[in-house]
Interface confidence: low
């Protein structure tokens, strides 16, 4: 599992919010969907 930068930005991609991450071979580890209170929960 790759670590994520806390200051990561995000973009909409295929109807999923995907956080920019370092050294992540797949977007799956960063798929979130909903961010509330600074915490990605879905």
């Amino acid at each position: 599992d790759a670590e994520f930068r806390h200051d990561s930005g995000y973009e909409v991609h295929h109807q999923k919010l995907v956080f920019f991450a370092e050294d992540v071979g797949s977007n799956k580890g960063a798929i979130i969907g909903l961010m509330v209170g600074g915490v990605v929960i879905a």
């Epitope: 806390h6 956080f19 798929i31 509330v36 915490v39 990605v40 929960i41």
Partner: antibody
């Protein structure tokens, strides 16, 4: 012991209101995203609403949008669900649940790892 | 909205292997979790992030997620495993549950 305890359910007439509470204990409630999930009699699970650590950040299922309001009081370690304009189809057991978070990897999805015992809401005349 | 489809029921003999499927469009692109709900009780998380077991969940519970289908496998099913099982995944802005599968251990 990590625990969630719901209260506030009961019998209410269509168009009425109820406020559900969920008291948390045994974990750091403040940063934890929290869910309300319901289950109609003999039916499956349906998410209702979710809230993050900031009470201004929440979302709702279309079926309850504009009628239900989720909130939390982190000083009391308590989650709430204000339900207005209740309908017969809102009859269900309502569960609160904690979103499991690995705080070292805050952008990961895990699941709802702690659930309350549920409180029954019956909407009937 | 995104939908997850499960068979309504699955039967298994004690000691045998039970497989419960959960289907959704390009499901492998999403993380899937599984919940066990015994009669009259609250749901319990048994699998998260496709194939990981929370502490306290027996090793006989395993899962996979490939293509359009996630599968929960219970190896050496026991009478205590009789329950409803729900798959769950993320939708665009929230969480979605499958309709549930009733596992009967005959």
């Amino acid at each position: 012991e990590v625990q969630l305890l719901e209260s506030g359910g009961g019998l209410v007439q269509p168009g009425g209101s109820l406020r559900l509470s969920c008291a948390a204990s045994g974990f750091d409630f403040g940063p934890s995203p929290m869910w309300w999930v319901r289950q109609a009699p003999g039916k499956g699970l349906e998410w209702v609403s979710v809230i993050g650590k900031d009470t201004q950040n929440s979302t709702y299922a279309d079926s309850v949008k504009g009628r239900f309001t989720i909130s939390r009081d982190n000083s009391k370690d308590t989650l709430y669900l204000q339900m207005n304009s209740l309908k017969a189809e809102d009859t269900a057991v309502y569960y609160c649940a904690r979103e499991w978070m690995d705080h070292s990897r805050p952008y990961y999805y895990y699941g709802m790892d702690v659930w309350g015992q549920g409180t029954l809401v019956t909407v009937s005349s | 909205s995104y939908e997850l489809t499960q068979p309504p029921s699955v039967s298994v003999s004690p000691g045998q292997t039970a497989s419960i499927t959960c289907s959704g469009h390009n499901l492998e692109d999403k993380f899937t979790s599984w919940y066990q709900q015994k009669s009259g009780q609250s749901p319990v998380l048994v699998i998260y992030r496709d194939d990981k077991r929370p502490s306290g969940i027996p090793e006989r519970f395993s899962a996979s997620n490939s293509g359009h289908t996630a599968t929960l496998t219970i190896s050496g099913a026991q009478a205590t495993d009789e329950a409803d099982y729900y798959c769950s995944s993320q939708d665009t802005v929230t969480r979605v549950f499958g309709g549930g599968t009733k596992l009967t251990v005959l």
